[in-house]
């Protein structure tokens, strides 16, 4: 059976039941690769209270429709007089980014999730060439979600003192130049999430490969690398790379623009102070 949402397949995704202190790991096309959940678990529940793991969805027992994915298990659940099995159910809705699976509720037998994602859209209008997961949970299971920063067209201009070049970036996905045809970005190669513009030329200096990472409390890191082997002649033989560090501000303040903090041999380091780097509880307070 072919994978129903191939663009979601490359990653293991996370969702949280905050009420019960549970972290779910979800891999919709394969298994989550957590030993304690067994070799074929597609949905693995990590109970942080008891430090135990339980598989609540088996990759082998998958059934799919256009908007619903179900993973059964062979574990029976306690509903009296029935032979129900524990299962996970993921409802997919069209969204503007890859999005995040959200825990909805869990009964004795079924763990329910909802996922707003471009992967579920009938038309390709919001689909990216390349996009990576754009959220993380910290050790207290609080969500840090940069999805609202993702530009569906155009890009962010990085604050840089160099008058001869302009560095444009998008967050977690490539820059869509087709929907923004009148700008400098038109020359940016397809797939690039970090585009360096020099005069009338534009260069791919990084594409998203891995999802967002939490490196320290309230510091999130996104790394882009140039996939093509061909070196750029102004990089002194080095492969271009871009590291964007998103920082939660220490106090309430207006959002800033991304700033270039270091540049050497086509390695660009960017810092972006933004409240989106803060956990969701902070944003909602």
């Amino acid at each position: 059976q072919a994978a129903p949402f191939p663009e979601l397949c490359s990653y293991t995704w996370e969702a949280v039941d905050t009420k019960n202190n549970v972290l779910y790991k979800i891999n919709i096309c394969g298994s989550v690769d957590i030993v304690q959940c067994g070799p074929s678990s597609a949905v693995c529940m990590h109970d942080l209270k008891t430090r135990t793991y339980h598989s609540v969805g088996d990759s082998v027992l998958r059934s799919a429709t256009r908007s619903l994915l179900e993973f059964n298990t062979t574990v029976s659940c306690d509903q009296q007089g029935t032979n129900h099995r524990v299962q996970s159910s993921i409802a997919f809705l069209c969204g503007k980014t890859l999005g995040t699976p959200e825990f909805v509720t869990a009964t004795e037998c079924v763990h329910y999730f909802e996922w707003r994602t471009t992967a579920a859209c009938k038309k390709d209008i919001f689909k990216a060439n390349k996009e990576v997961p754009c959220y993380v949970f910290d050790e207290e299971l609080r969500k840090h979600d940069l999805n609202p920063l993702i530009k569906l067209s155009g890009a962010y201009l990085v604050d840089d003192s160099d008058p001869d070049t302009s560095l444009f970036i998008n967050v977690c996905r490539d820059i869509d130049t087709l929907r923004d045809p009148g700008s400098q970005l038109r020359a940016c190669p397809p797939g690039t999430a970090a585009c360096l513009v020099r005069g009338h030329q534009a260069f791919d200096v990084g594409q998203p490969r891995d999802g967002l990472k939490l490196v320290r409390k309230d510091r999130l890191v996104l790394s882009y690398v140039r996939e093509e082997a061909g070196k750029l002649d102004f990089c002194d033989g080095h492969s271009p790379a871009v590291t964007i560090t998103f920082v939660c501000p220490s106090e309430r303040r207006e959002g800033t623009i991304p700033k270039l903090t270091a540049k050497s041999n086509c390695r660009y380091e960017i810092e972006w102070i933004t409240e989106y780097a803060c956990h969701r509880d902070y944003l909602e307070s």
Epitope: D17, A106, E108, C109
Partner: nanobody, 116 residues
Framework: DVQLVESGGGLVQPGGSLRLSCAAS????????MDWYRQAPGKQREWVAT???????TYADSVKGRFTISRDNAKNTVYLQMNSLRPEDTAVYYC??????????WGQGTLVTVSS
């Protein structure tokens, strides 16, 4: 005052059954996740079963198929039905309530002895 009170422990023969109760007061019971733990003499406290606020249940491998956790929200009580008891089930059984807004609350424990 927030408290949990366990009851139902006692002496039972191997293969027998017991039902433990844990009555809660001072908390919105249905919002809380409830866990049973046990501590055998000279051993560390170990987790036995969980009943989440939404209703899902999980069990330690050692009790799976023999023990059942359930709750009665009207009575603010969680139960642990223990069947096919074995000598190695002998322990003090504790219940625990937890929610995102409260620190974990433990009961004082009830002793279960399985012996012939």
């Amino acid at each position: 005052d927030v408290q949990l009170v366990e009851s139902g422990g006692g002496l039972v023969q191997p293969g027998g059954s017991l039902r433990l109760s844990c009555a809660a007061s001072g908390i919105i019971f249905s919002d809380n996740r409830m866990d049973w733990y046990r501590q055998a003499p000279g051993k560390q406290r170990e987790w036995v079963a969980t009943l989440a606020s939404y209703g899902w249940k999980t069990y330690a491998d050692s009790v799976k198929g023999r023990f059942t956790i359930s709750r009665d929200n009207a009575k603010n009580t969680v139960y642990l039905q223990m069947n096919s008891l074995r000598p190695e089930d002998t322990a003090v059984y504790y219940c625990k309530a937890s929610s995102p807004v409260l620190n974990d609350i433990w009961g004082q424990g009830t002793l279960v002895t399985v012996s012939s």
